[in-house]
């Protein structure tokens, strides 16, 4: 018993005066407390309590279950306890089987005995199953075994806590562990479009998948910028242990222009936070874009090919393609084809293939493209360079030489004079007219030039060059002159071509 | 004998938050797990989530997360649930309940909470 | 989650009748043979009382006209004859994994 200096307050005091009492089932429980301001028996067992106002505790027939710790509380609040063991072979356990361990923290077993001497008080594996080799345990017979830094891994381990009774072992009935883990890592989230196109009035739905290894998970979708709940719905599934997997899913049921912006999902654990997020434009209507990936001027050589490609936007999708020349529709010679292969893609690519243009094939080429909302279209003006050909060369009664040459770009057209016999013609001569003749005439067709000398400047025999010219090549012609006396004739005009 | 012993009914508006108290006696508090279920008028019991023994961490049914909490006082063996962001979905009588031997052995009478403009 | 689905929803019967009431999980809800489905009694303006725990066992006070059978997804509670204090509504509930659940109930009445 408790020993105290005269004058302080003492603890009560317990008959029988020992630590730990053993009696048997069936058998009478008699503790006497005695303190002068003695309040209160309570009796403890399993961490259930319950309280007695008389200074003695009777327990007539006593059970399994009047094990437990009685405690005798005076009015300064001093206690003094007796711990009584009901002895039961029938029930050598008190259980409370919820059994749930933090990761990497201490879990009790509560299992306290009725018997103090049974030997071999332990845990033991379900169905003669072995314990993990790391469990490590400390048993304790009035409170039950308390496992050391339970892991992950003990997760739904089925026990029995043990003794050894009359050289037979007993065990209790089963404890399943529930773990519950430690966040050792942010959690994973994903979302099903990074971004989303929708016009006024569409349904709005964006799922979020958030994995962990538990449902403690937090998630939530947020709109950037503000404060407002969104509605979410949840599905969730646990694919076998610490293998936890929540889609929450966002809708917006018809949304408005003023929906636009950047929703993200948010998770955090003890851990950590993730987060991922998506884009939502929402239009007024749908809208087609153009962009030629060529310049709209486009100029080619004759008998070369060219590729006149756009891409576009369309939303929603493109219902309608063509590209027209001269008011013909093309049934072959282009392709239309989606930009990417991604669920959200809108950009789309359209090439019309041309092939050996001839001089005559300049024009313009128009791609047009329609969806449900609107149309669009782009023109490319193509022009095909051609050499010069020289259409006329002529000497008029009016003593002129003339030249007339056709081409693109449009020619320039020289005049030389050969003196004699010579091969080489170096003196140029300059016209007294030129003229572009068909300016008026068709947009994309050759141009036309007319030049003209004047013949009597020349006093010799001798060559003419009209050479006519341009970025892709030159022709030339001449004309050839004899005196006889002081007349001057024209004699057999012809031309040469020159690469 | 155990008891657990709600705070009283409360009516709150929409937005506002509710604090509902549990306090338990014929225990040893910190060593049970408390849960929260509530029931809606002429509806059936929901889980909203647990706090356990021991370290005092908590799991709550996703359907309230971001809008519950759940505290201990162990001074005065008192469990707490609030509730924020209130919505007449709210309107529910809420229980609490502690685990014992793997089931809810015991219950708080209920605290109704009414949300209402 | 596990999602529990009780039937009947509503049951009308006789003082002295034999009830049964399913419940069915969407997965098992055993661990280690060990069922954690539990029945609980609700009557109207009253906390849940505790029935049955871990699919058969009477919790204590609880008369035995009660009992639980079971495994795996498919639970059921009978009551042996009814009596006039068990006009009430029955839930089911499982805790085998969080969000732990409840079956939507099974409101017995009086014929």
């Known amino acids: 018993q408790p020993s105290v200096s005269p004058g302080e307050p003492s603890p009560p005091s317990i008959h029988p005066g020992k630590s730990d009492l053993i009696v048997r089932v069936g058998d009478e429980i008699r503790l006497l407390c005695t303190d002068p301001g003695f309040v209160k028996w309570t009796f403890e067992i399993l961490d259930e309590t319950n309280e007695n106002k008389q200074n003695e505790w009777i327990t007539e027939k006593a059970e399994a279950t009047n094990t437990g710790k009685y405690t005798c509380t005076n009015k300064h609040g001093l206690s003094n306890s007796i711990y009584v063991f009901v002895r039961d072979p029938a029930k050598l356990f008190l259980v409370d089987r919820s059994l749930y361990g933090k990761e990497d923290n201490d879990t009790l077993v509560r299992c306290p005995l009725t018997d103090p001497e049974v030997t071999n008080y332990s845990l033991k594996g379900c169905q003669g199953k072995p314990l993990p080799k790391d469990l490590r345990f400390i048993p304790d017979p009035k409170a039950g075994i308390m496992i050391k830094s339970v892991k992950r891994a003990y997760h739904r381990l089925c026990l029995h806590c043990s003794v050894d009774q009359e050289g037979k072992s007993v065990l209790s009935e089963k404890f399943i562990l529930k773990v519950r883990p430690a966040f050792k890592a942010v959690p994973v989230v994903s979302v099903s479009k990074a971004s989303y196109l929708l016009r006024e009035g569409e349904e709005f739905t964006v799922t979020c998948t958030i994995k962990d290894v538990s449902s403690s998970v937090y998630s939530t979708w947020k709109r950037e910028n503000s404060q407002t709940k969104l509605q979410e719905k949840y599905n969730s599934w646990h694919h076998g242990d610490f293998n936890y997997e929540r889609q929450a899913t966002l809708t917006i049921s018809s949304a408005r222009v003023n929906d636009s912006g950047v929703f993200m999902c948010y998770a955090n654990n003890t851990f950590g936070s993730a987060n991922v997020t998506t884009t939502l434009e929402v239009v007024d209507k749908g809208f087609i874009n153009i962009f030629p990936m060529i310049n709209t001027t486009v100029f080619v050589n004759d008998g070369e090919n060219v590729d006149l490609i756009v891409e576009y936007e369309a939303f929603p999708k493109p219902e309608h393609q063509q590209w027209i020349y001269m008011n013909r529709t093309f049934t072959d010679k282009w392709e239309d084809y989606p930009k990417s292969e991604n669920e959200s893609n809108i950009r789309y690519v359209s090439e019309l293939h041309l092939t050996r243009l001839k001089g005559t094939e300049g024009g313009t080429y128009t791609f047009l493209v329609s969806n449900s909302d609107v149309n669009a279209a782009i023109a490319f003006n193509v022009y095909v360079n051609t050499k010069p050909e020289i259409l006329t060369y002529d000497r008029l009664v009016n003593g002129m030489l003339q030249c007339v040459a056709a081409g693109f770009p449009e020619p320039t057209i020289d005049w030389y004079f050969c003196p004699g016999t010579e091969q080489r013609c170096s003196a140029s001569v300059l016209p007294v007219d030129v003229q572009t003749l068909n300016s008026s005439g068709p947009p994309f067709g050759k141009l036309v030039v007319q030049s003209s000398i004047d013949s009597s400047a020349f006093k010799h025999n001798g060559t003419v060059e009209c050479k006519a010219y341009n970025d892709v090549g030159k022709t030339s012609a001449y004309f050839n002159f004899a005196f006889k006396g002081n007349n001057k004739e024209q004699i057999h005009p012809h031309t040469l071509f020159t690469p | 004998q155990v008891q657990l012993v709600q705070s009283g009914a409360e009516v709150k508006k929409p937005g506002a938050s509710v604090k509902v108290s549990c306090k338990a006696s014929g225990y040893t508090f910190t060593s049970y797990n408390m849960h929260w279920v509530r029931q809606a008028p002429g509806q059936g019991l929901e889980w909203m989530g647990v706090i356990y023994s021991g370290q005092g961490d908590t799991s709550y049914n996703q359907k309230f997360k971001g809008r519950v909490t759940m505290t201990t006082d162990t001074s005065t063996s008192t469990a707490y649930m609030e509730l924020r962001s209130l919505t007449s979905d709210d309107t529910a009588v809420y229980y609490c309940?502690?685990?014992?031997?793997?089931?809810?052995?015991?219950w708080g009478q209920g605290t109704l909470v009414t949300v209402s403009a | 989650e596990i999602v529990l689905t009780q039937s009947p929803s509503s049951l009308s019967a006789s003082v002295g009748d034999r009830v049964t009431i399913t419940c069915r999980a969407s997965?098992?809800?055993?661990?280690?043979?060990?069922?954690?489905m539990h029945w609980y009694q609700q009557k109207p303006g009253k906390a849940p009382k505790l029935l049955i725990y871990?699919?058969?066992n009477l919790e204590s006070g609880v008369p035995s006209r009660f009992s639980g059978s079971g495994s795996g997804t498919d639970f059921t509670l009978t009551i042996s004859s009814l009596q006039p204090e068990d006009f009430a509504t029955y839930y089911c509930?499982?805790?085998?994994?969080?969000?732990?659940?409840f079956g939507q109930g099974t409101k017995l009445e009086i014929k």
């Open positions: 871990l699919a058969s």
């Open positions: 309940a502690r685990e014992r031997d793997t089931r809810f052995g015991n």
């Open positions: 509930q499982q805790n085998k994994e969080e969000p732990y659940t």
């Open positions: 997965e098992s809800v055993d661990i280690y043979g060990e069922s954690f």
